[in-house]
Amino acid sequence: PTSSWNISSELNKDSYLTLDEPMNNITTSLGQTAELHCKVSGNPPPTIRWFKNDAPVVQEPRRLSFRSTIYGSRLRIRNLDTTDTGYFQCVATNGKEVVSSTGVLF
């Protein structure tokens, strides 16, 4: 139990969460592909969620998806339509802290 407590203390002491780069606004054309990058780092490794216009992003097979990357997370939208425009936000948490960044897709 003592060693477990020490390990958890070390984890708490070294925990951090950083937004490494603000998300860019993107202006693109119909039918093209857009990528939004959420660049965060942290310990423990952060969990990242994506939102569009204040709501969780709906993934669509072969068209809209997001995945973890070495730098955080990437959201990709293929075959862009005017309906895709909006405010996109990534929210990252390491269990203790929360950081977020917003980009506009037009």
């Epitope: 709501a55 005017t82 895709d84």
Partner: antibody, heavy 120, light 107 residues
């Protein structure tokens, strides 16, 4: 205090033109989108057009595309709706509304509206 | 286009009643639905956004909920000032599309 004030409505003949204005105050105009939404007498809300002046993005409802033009003058904090080739079915109260800071569609502040009547 | 089917189109209720208005989206809109109140001759006012978030200054008797693509606006105890027309709007897909409205009248 956020305020939106529309003006420019009135009676116009079919085929005529009108320009509506939406004067904004109390917020950083170029950081928010502005919608025009209309309401025909006794009917529901119909979205017309949207502009984000800070990015230069515009979009229109199919029913007005090619006839209406939305624009903005950031130095005057004012959005405009130029309406050409007006039809009887364009008769409505026209509202301008500001988007919230986290959504392109949620409209958190509205003007009082201006009435456009298209009739011969 | 995404359709928002609102029901009922009108209802009669008394002060103190619990009132429920529903809206169904024709496809997924996540939790991005807003509700507005409009009184005759006035502009709409935002009540709820993101399906269940109460807008600043709106009384707590108003609430919103989501079940899949079905969205509900509830007024827990109807007050005299609540007699109005209510509109839902999906705000996920741009531009937002409105429901046809529900008129809440005095019984």
């Amino acid at each position: 205090e956020v305020q939106l004030v529309e003006s420019g409505g009135g009676l116009v003949q079919p085929g005529g033109s009108l320009r509506l204005s939406c004067a904004a105050s109390g917020f950083t105009f170029s950081s928010y989108g502005i919608h025009w939404v209309r309401q025909a007498p006794g009917k529901g809300l119909e979205w017309v057009a949207y502009i984000h002046s800070g990015i230069g993005y515009t979009i229109y409802a199919d029913s007005v595309k090619g006839r209406f033009t939305i624009s903005a003058d950031t130095s005057k904090n004012t959005a405009y709706l130029q309406m050409n080739s007006l039809r009887a079915e364009d008769t409505a109260v026209y509202y301008c509304a500001r988007t919230s800071s986290t959504s392109t569609s949620v409209m958190d502040y509205w003007g009082q509206g201006t009435l456009v009547t298209v009739s011969s | 286009d995404i359709q928002m089917t609102q029901s009922p189109s009108s209802l009669s209720a008394s002060v103190g009643d619990r009132v429920t208005i529903t809206c169904r989206a024709s496809q997924s809109v996540s939790s991005a639905v807003a509700w507005y109140q409009q009184k005759p001759g006035k502009a709409p006012k935002l009540l709820i956004y993101s399906a269940s978030s109460l807008y600043s200054g709106v009384p707590s008797r108003f609430s919103g909920s989501r079940s899949g693509t079905d969205f509900t606006l509830t007024i827990s105890s109807l007050q005299p000032e609540d007699f109005a027309t209510y509109y839902c709007q999906q705000t996920y897909w741009s531009p937002g599309t409105f429901g046809q409205g529900t008129k809440v009248e005095i019984k």
